[in-house]
Amino acid sequence: DAGVIQSPRHEVTEMGQEVTLRCKPISGHNSLFWYRQTMMRGLELLIYFNNNVPIDDSGMPEDRFSAKMPNASFSTLKIQPSEPRDSAVYFCASSL
């Protein structure tokens, strides 16, 4: 099993541009989670989906952030417009 697959691995963008992160969960997993990690703020849960439905997006109250899960095998996290403080490692995770 390839595990959770994210793309891109690295992203550099200018402030104000749109950024889209992609995730392919493990096949058969019905929960998907997006996290953000920075030195200053630690690990933050942004949103999670169960059976493609967003359950809790309270970790991303800024409407610059949006996430979708159109089907069981794909999710996107979009930031528009991006800001310097969005610089972080973004993790996608999935579970049964």
Epitope: D56, S58, G59, P61, E62, D63, E83
Partner: antibody
Amino acid sequence: EVQLVESGGGLVQPGGSLRLSCAASGFTFSNGGMHWVRQAPGKGLEWVSYISSGSSTIYYADTLKGRFTISRDNSKNTLYLQMNSLRAEDTAVYYCARRGEGAMDYWGQGTTVTVSS
Amino acid sequence: DNQLTQSPSFLSASVGDRVTITCRASSSVNYIYWYQQKPGKAPKLLIYYTSNLAPGVPSRFSGSGSGNEYTLTISSLQPEDFATYYCQQFTSSPFTFGQGTKLEIK
């Protein structure tokens, strides 16, 4: 029916502390974000702080960082605001509000904080 | 911080009038949210995501706009609409409010 009930306000001297509480009912408190907003007498609304469902994401108004601390206890369906080093300009009605529709869809009735010697 | 400026700050109008309140942002925002507040009461959400009416809000209220400029329109003022109106942005923390527009009976 969604209900938010603030408590803990009162009269406090400059430099003092208060802890406000917001008791939530009528919805799944542990599944959503919560805000504090304040309104000084005769003035407009001022956003104070936000906390996500699991407390991993927290934001503060720049002017309040370091003095105010937001927290929550999901087992008690309660939101808190710890306010330290209080100043006269912190005198206001403090509201808790539920995050909903991307905004604040339900508000409490408010609790009054007066900072005066 | 993104500063929101509402105009006018005060507005006198009569029952049946059509009124428009403008909210201008110092930096572009994705959406604007509108609240109504009556004296001694908590604010009430009116419009979310720029143009969506909150549950129970009459259809005489509408919202529009994009970028830096947004509007709240009341098509035909009713006695219960006399209140103070606030815009707010959630595009970027801190989640600033406009200074408010007080709508008074002429």
